[in-house]
């Protein structure tokens, strides 16, 4: 008799995702020397340990600290970049800026980008058909709260200037309830970061708009400036330019405004 | 308020730089378009101007015009005029966002091409 | 290229009706509404009607209307006024700042 199997709203785990998180953590640590002492297959059981027979709404960070502990990783803390809702161009940024990094930058958050993971209460089976949806099922499950884990983590390694990149095509350029503004920016540390850069980065067309006035930008600065960091804001008017002016940053239009 | 001066007769291959003078409004936070009508005909955008400083131009205008500006005014450059330049040349305010058009026009000032 | 086309060169009605100007795009203009609508007389500026496809501009009557999304875009004036005797243009705004125009409509009133 085939057991009930709870439907959740969510898509279900990325297909062949042992295999997937397993192949990405060899790839990352053949590829940064730092790390080349973390053993892959261990990871990957700290990785399954966290969700596999837990109900996949009652997941803790607690859950999650043996797989923090293995990942442990040193990144330079002045060379934090935090994005939202615009992961792409944050990505691409640090392709270029080799010496920056992204959370995805990172091994944890390197394996997880982009997946879906959940269990079952009681059996030790991977749900491929659905996992909790974060605003229709639960907050607590496996995958929001890895990455508010490793969100927080990353966010209170930070030091002197961070940089965000925040979508200015967005009708909220900054949102309170994004992970950078639940999580990452509650968790700067004042003794240690300075400044928060943010970066407003114009959509797929300019305007003259100064988009670091607008009012929630005015509401990330008020919250940054009562936590006693200090904040600045860029429009980044052309991304394409942007890039291309970080590639080769002696191009002559590069010292126009971008 | 917008208007546009320095239209006029030229010979081929001379060129002629239009300006276009504004008050009541910052340059630093507005884009600036440029458009033409040739006689009896439709109206054709030529280019833009940003707060930022960056330009932007139709396909077939790019390399004929240049525009550029200061802190009031903003300049079109016909770099090598010929006879098919010849219209009113207008410039416009461009709204942004929510109100996107364009919501400010000049007069227009006349250019002839003509040998 | 962006291509803006305006079917009708010309259009007629008697005072009192409703003239209906399409104007469809070669592609979507950006965030689907960046189109606007302006009336051209005789030696005056160009006045903006509508922008952003469907918000009239301050000053102009209700009788003008703007609809439309992505491609396909319509301004219909109606209780026709000798007044509104003019050519119309719309522009779209595309992704990369590029703007274009359509080639116009003539509105006759009777």
């Known amino acids: 008799v085939p057991r009930w199997r709870q439907q959740w709203s969510g898509p279900g785990t990325t297909k062949r995702f042992p295999e997937t998180v397993l192949a990405r953590c060899v790839k990352y640590t053949e590829i940064h020397p730092e790390m080349r002492h973390v053993d892959c297959q261990s990871v990957w059981d700290a990785f399954k340990g966290a969700f596999i027979s837990k109900h996949p709404c009652n997941i803790t960070e607690e859950d999650y600290q043996p797989l923090m502990k293995l990942g442990t990783q040193t990144v330079p803390c002045n060379k934090i970049l935090l994005w939202s809702r615009i992961k792409d161009l944050a990505h691409q940024f640090t392709q270029v800026q080799r010496d920056m990094f992204t959370l995805e930058d990172t091994l944890l958050g390197y394996l997880a980008d982009d997946l879906t993971w959940c269990g079952e209460f009681n059996t030790s089976k991977i749900n491929y058909q659905s996992c909790p949806d974060w605003r229709k099922d639960c907050s607590n499950n496996p995958v929001s709260v890895f990455w508010k884990t490793v969100s927080r983590r990353f966010a209170e390694a930070a030091c002197d200037v961070v940089h965000v990149m925040l979508n200015g095509s967005r009708s909220k350029i900054f949102d309170k309830n994004s992970t950078f503004g639940s999580v990452e920016v509650h968790n700067l540390q004042p003794e240690k970061v300075q400044t928060l850069e943010a970066w407003v980065i114009h959509g797929g067309r300019e305007d003259s708009r100064d988009l670091c006035q607008d009012p929630t930008i005015k509401e990330l600065e008020s919250i940054i400036s009562k936590r006693n960091i200090q904040f600045s804001c860029k429009n980044i008017y052309r991304p394409d330019k942007f890039l291309q002016c970080v590639k080769n940053p002696e191009d002559s239009s590069c010292t126009s405004e971008i | 308020s917008v208007e546009e001066s320095g239209g006029r007769l030229v010979t081929p291959g001379t060129p002629l730089t239009l300006t276009c003078t504004v008050s009541?409004?910052?340059?630093?936070?507005?884009?600036i378009s440029w458009v033409r009508q040739a006689p009896g005909k439709g109206l054709q955008w030529i280019g833009s101007i940003y707060g930022s400083g960056n330009t932007y131009y139709a396909t077939w205008a790019k390399g004929r015009f240049t525009v550029s500006k200061t802190s009031t005014t903003v300049d079109l450059k016909i770099n090598s005029p010929t006879t098919e330049d010849t219209a009113t040349y207008f410039c416009?305010?461009?709204?942004?966002?929510?109100?996107?058009?364009?919501?400010?026009w000049g007069p227009g000032t006349l250019v002839t091409v003509s040998s | 290229a962006q291509v803006l086309t305006q079917t009708a060169s010309s259009v007629s009605a008697a005072v009192g009706g409703t003239v209906t100007i399409s104007c469809q795009s070669s592609e979507s203009v950006y965030k689907n509404n960046y189109l606007s609508w302006y009336q051209q007389k005789p030696g005056q500026p160009l006045k903006c009607l509508i922008y952003s496809a469907s918000t009239l501009a301050s000053g102009v009557p209700s009788r003008f209307k703007g609809s439309g999304s992505g491609t396909q875009f319509t301004l219909t004036i109606s209780d026709l006024e000798s007044d509104d005797a003019a050519t119309y243009y719309c522009?779209?705004?595309?992704?990369?700042?590029?703007?274009?125009f359509g080639g116009g409509t003539e509105v006759v009133v009777k």
């Open positions: 416009a305010r461009e709204g942004a966002g929510s109100s996107w058009g364009f919501n400010l």
């Open positions: 522009a779209g705004g595309y992704s990369g700042n590029i703007n274009g």
């Open positions: 009541g409004f910052s340059l630093s936070n507005n884009a």
